[in-house]
């Protein structure tokens, strides 16, 4: 950066080189050039000469004043006009930064994705700080009182092998930068309660021609967790509202869920699972698109209306469960 140049003088910033965005700041330049009594001192920001708010303090020093400085980063340098020199002489340079102190980290969440071998902790960092902000994740065993600290700039993956202090832990996050430090509330976790099953994936769909054609969605997960609860949401791509089917699942075999869908319509499906009774869900699976065949079922409209959903479709499943409506919108 510009701070690596050879200086013939000194440049400094008040209140500091890293300061709160929107502050008024002063940049001082003091020349110390052999055989030079500077006629004039010039300031440059990002290579562009500044014209205003420059005050000469004495023979060797000048001040540049900025009101309400809002740039996250700027490279400053100053030069002197020396007698008998055609060009300006470089005095010194400095990189300056403005930003904000960190917000209190909140929504601290720790999960163990099955087979990952890691506990992944994330949090809401709050507003953008614009300056280098580090986070220290504290993990304290409630059984041994032993505390471990992990330094990161975003989220953290902690090897489950390193969690030797039993199953119960307190987790909290400290955020710090040059402008301040904040600490989150403590999150109490039990390692057995934060496991998210291996991702559920929809593999294919088929429509079976029967008196009333039915669509079978095939889906699976590599999870070894015995008790898993899942949701499958689906809708016609022209509809706004998701329909959600909930069921308990045993992944010792590929799952088959049956749907009675309207003909010649494009549908989208997604699935997600959690260990039954636990807190955290998988993210929704990749979008699975399926278009039903054109054949219209040969039944009376009255028969077709029996037990239909409000979007004109019905659902059954090999797994037990019930159907709910979900207005969460188009979440990918």
């Amino acid at each position: 950066g510009i701070t690596n140049i050879n200086c013939s003088g000194h440049i400094w910033v008040e209140p500091a080189t890293i300061f709160k965005m929107g502050m008024n700041i002063s940049i001082y330049c003091q020349a110390a050039i052999k055989n030079c009594q500077p006629r004039k001192l010039h300031f440059y920001k990002n290579g562009i000469k500044e014209r205003f708010q420059i005050t000469r303090i004495n023979k060797t020093t000048a001040r540049l004043w900025y009101k309400n400085f809002l740039e996250p980063h700027a490279s400053m340098y100053c030069t002197a006009e020396c007698p008998k020199h055609f060009q300006e002489t470089l005095i010194c340079g400095k990189d300056i930064s403005s930003g904000y102190p960190p917000d209190i980290p909140d929504e601290v969440t720790c999960v163990i994705y099955e087979y990952s071998g890691n506990m992944t902790c994330t949090w809401n960092a709050g507003k953008l700080t614009y300056i280098d902000t580090k986070y220290v994740v504290h993990v304290k065993s409630l059984e041994t009182e032993e505390e471990q600290q992990y330094l990161t700039s975003s989220y953290i993956n902690i090897s489950t092998d390193s969690l030797q202090g039993g199953k119960k832990y307190l987790v909290w996050v400290q955020a710090a930068n040059a402008l301040g430090m904040e600490e989150s509330k403590q999150l109490q976790i039990h390692l057995d309660d934060i496991v998210i099953p291996s991702a559920a994936v929809i593999s294919r769909a088929e429509t079976i021609n029967a008196t009333v054609p039915k669509t079978i969605i095939y889906w699976d997960s590599q999870t070894t967790i015995e008790k898993v609860s899942c949701e499958m949401r689906y809708k016609a791509t022209t509809n706004q509202t998701w329909n959600v089917k909930e069921f308990d699942t045993n992944f010792t075999y590929v799952q088959q869920s049956e749907f009675y869908l309207e003909p010649n319509i494009k549908y989208v499906f997604q699935v997600r699972c959690q260990e039954t009774g636990k807190r955290y869900w998988q993210p929704w699976s990749s979008l699975f698109f399926h278009k039903t065949p054109e054949t219209v079922p040969q039944v009376t409209s009255k028969a077709f209306q029996h037990d239909t959903w409000n979007s004109g479709l019905t659902v059954a499943s090999i797994s037990t469960g019930h159907l709910t409506s979900d207005n969460r919108g188009d979440i990918g």
Epitope: S203, E206, V268, L287, F288, T292, P293, E294, I331, G332
Partner: antibody, heavy 120, light 111 residues
């Protein structure tokens, strides 16, 4: 190794019908959709239609009345039939696959194409 | 049907320059948090090749010189820096709605 291979008649007389077969390997037609795209000499790509894994079809609005797409999953073959051909149907005809159950949701593998010339 | 308008129709660049190709859809091609817009490269005598899927994702094996951006109706394919091997015709395609539609293509030539 994923492959698609088009085979067609090469030359078709005006007002006659065109039949092209796309034979695929390395993936299942029950899980992937297959699209047909054509390209007249020196011109751009034109989407003709598709057959979903389920067997359902979608067609280019302007060609819908002349087109039909079918498939035989067990033989790994997809069939394009186009009726009432005219000279402006002369083109390179391609088949391509799309997976609609995850990324990329795009035509990631294409056949080399088969040339169809409509002429008397 | 969604109409895809590509610009420019052609451009000639020197090696090392940046190529920017634009594609505008007549209506949004976004749904479920994705932009169903893809970019293909076609060289003479060859079928098209997928470069970018879902607006900004680089297909496996495609050089990092290629990048895609945009959402809803306005999309851009960027090649930076351009190499001799990039001389080809580039097409955008949407499959948010059936019927799928392609842009008319942009021919990239080397000066």
């Amino acid at each position: 190794d994923v492959q698609l291979q088009e085979s067609g008649p090469g030359l078709v007389a005006p007002s006659q019908s065109l039949s092209i077969t796309c034979t695929v390997s390395g993936f299942s037609l029950s899980r992937y959709s297959v699209h047909w795209v054509r390209q007249p000499p020196g011109k751009g790509l034109e989407w003709l239609g598709m057959i979903w894994g389920s067997g359902s079809t979608d067609y280019n609005s302007a060609l819908k009345s002349r087109l039909s797409i079918n498939k035989d999953n067990s033989k790994s073959q997809v069939f394009l039939k186009m009726n009432s051909l005219q000279t402006d149907d002369t083109a390179m005809y391609y088949c391509a696959r799309v997976y609609y159950g995850g990324s990329p949701y795009a035509m990631d593998y294409w056949g080399q194409g088969t040339t169809v010339t409509v002429s008397s | 049907d969604i109409v895809m308008t590509q610009s420019p129709a052609s451009l000639a660049l020197s090696l090392g320059q940046r190529a920017t190709i634009s594609c505008r859809a007549s209506e949004s091609v976004d749904s479920y948090g994705n932009s169903f817009m893809h970019w293909y490269q076609q060289k003479p005598g060859q079928p098209p090749k997928l470069l970018i899927y879902l607006a900004s994702n680089l297909e496996s094996g495609v050089p990092a010189r290629f990048s895609g951006s945009g959402s809803r109706t306005d999309f851009t394919l960027t090649i930076d820096p351009v190499e001799a091997d990039d001389a080809a015709i580039y097409y955008c395609q949407q499959n948010n709605e059936e019927p799928n539609t392609f842009g008319a293509g942009t021919k990239l030539e080397m000066k």
